[in-house]
């Protein structure tokens, strides 16, 4: 089936896009797959649907499950599935593999690390970046829009990078973190 895995941490915001894309004018209905119960669109709910987006503000472990989105055009209905898993926050610094986004490679000439999923959120700069849980400091590191740029990349720059930002929804702020590995390749 047309399905997409999404994951997040409890007490953080998680926004999921219906994997079945449609034209902006098409309506999208969201359901809990197990119960076929409709997900409300009212923003006062902690979990609510907003067009192609399903918003968990904030997410809870019990939100884990499969969600169905049905995109409706005047003549076609197309179904997608979002497989959502919400994990408990780790007490230690290690980010487990199941929370990692895809690995990116960089070199001396090209060292952009994109903050995963950030385009789904209503955030404002600056992004905070961490490597192996340490806040990145120094002139070699530049947070530029949704990227981290590392100047003069070295082998030691390889590791796990976490971006942290705030999602704003109707005046309320929610934290979001996302982690991915960075590897350094020789030119």
């Amino acid at each position: 089936k047309f399905s997409k895995q999404s994951w997040g941490l409890e007490n953080e915001a998680l926004i999921v896009r219906c994997p079945r894309q449609g034209k902006p004018s098409y309506t999208v209905d969201w359901y809990y797959s197990q119960t076929n119960k409709s997900i409300p669109t009212q923003e006062r709910n902690r979990v609510f649907a907003s067009g192609q987006l399903l918003k968990f503000l904030p997410a809870a472990v019990e939100d884990s499950g499969i969600y169905t989105c049905i995109v409706r055009s005047p003549t076609f209905n197309r179904t997608g599935y979002a497989n959502v898993t919400i994990y408990k926050k780790q007490s230690d610094c290690n980010v487990p593999d199941y929370l990692m986004y895809s690995t990116v490679s960089g070199s001396e000439k090209n060292s952009k690390i994109y903050c995963p999923t950030i385009d789904l959120y209503n955030w404002t700069a600056p992004l905070e970046w961490f490597k192996n849980c340490q806040a990145l400091q120094g002139s070699r590191y530049r947070a530029h829009k949704s990227f981290l740029v590392i100047d003069n990349v070295m082998t030691e720059d390889a590791g796990d990078y976490t971006c942290k930002f705030i999602h704003n929804e109707n005046g309320a702020n929610y934290s979001v973190t996302a982690t991915r590995s960075f590897t350094v390749k020789d030119e």
């Epitope: 047309f2 449609g22 034209k23 055009s73 076609f76 197309r78 179904t79």
Partner: antibody, heavy 123, light 107 residues
């Protein structure tokens, strides 16, 4: 009612050129991706080319790449296929069709088709 | 490109019988697969989209199933007007490709 009407087919010599037109009506032409599909006599269907709606991005089958050009005039609700360097194997009925859904980077089915126009390449 | 192989090439059946047509993809197309019906001298007509959804106005005797690489079009009880050629088409990626067709003929 959605209607697609092809024209411009005919007999042409190998190496020659032809321009097919498809006049669309009954829907907001500019927001839909449009497609050319052909069918050689007694054979199956072959996708030829697609063009995005307002963005105008184009896609071609390897068999026609570099020889055929798809275009559209949204102000005239018309789709075109300019066919150059025609070969005998291009002989087919050419259909224009509408993709009712697709978003950037994706494709969908063809829900409305024209009646087709016959292109014969022969000396 | 993704190759779609339809079987059988020809299906000889009587009105009222059940028709089962197969379409196999050379690689997974998820459920991005459609079925069309074409009668002589006519343009194809969309029957099924997203592997199992009937297009508007298509009778309930037509049903589609499958996902990934193996798909089936079933006509539960053939009507005289159902004798035609049927094509599957994938639209997960360009180039869009069609199967070679299955002809359903009167026995």
């Amino acid at each position: 009612e959605v209607q697609l009407l092809e024209s411009g087919g005919g007999l042409v010599q190998p190496g020659g050129s032809l321009r097919l037109s498809c006049a669309a009506s009954g829907f907001t032409f500019s927001i839909y991706d449009m497609i050319w599909v052909r069918q050689a006599p007694g054979k199956g269907l072959e996708w030829v080319s697609s063009i995005r709606g307002e963005g105008g991005g184009t896609y071609y089958a390897d068999s026609v790449k570099g020889r055929f050009t798809i275009s559209r005039d949204n102000s005239k609700n018309t789709l075109y296929l300019q066919m150059n360097s025609l070969r005998a194997e291009d002989t087919a009925v050419y259909y224009c069709a509408r993709d009712p859904w697709s978003t950037e980077g994706s494709f969908f089915v063809l829900d409305y088709w024209g009646q087709g126009t016959l292109v014969t390449v022969s000396s | 490109e993704i190759v779609l192989t339809q079987s059988p090439a020809t299906l000889s059946l009587s009105p009222g019988e059940r028709a089962t047509l197969s379409c196999r993809a050379s690689q997974s197309v998820d459920d991005d697969l459609a079925w069309y019906q074409q009668k002589p001298g006519q343009a194809p007509r969309l029957l099924i989209y997203d592997a199992s959804n009937r297009a508007t106005g298509i009778p309930a005797r037509f049903s589609g199933s499958g996902s990934g690489t193996d798909f089936t079009l079933t006509i539960s009880s053939l009507e005289p007007e159902d004798f035609a050629v049927y094509y599957c088409q994938q639209y997960i990626t360009a180039p869009l490709t069609f199967g070679q067709g299955t002809k359903v003929e009167i026995k």
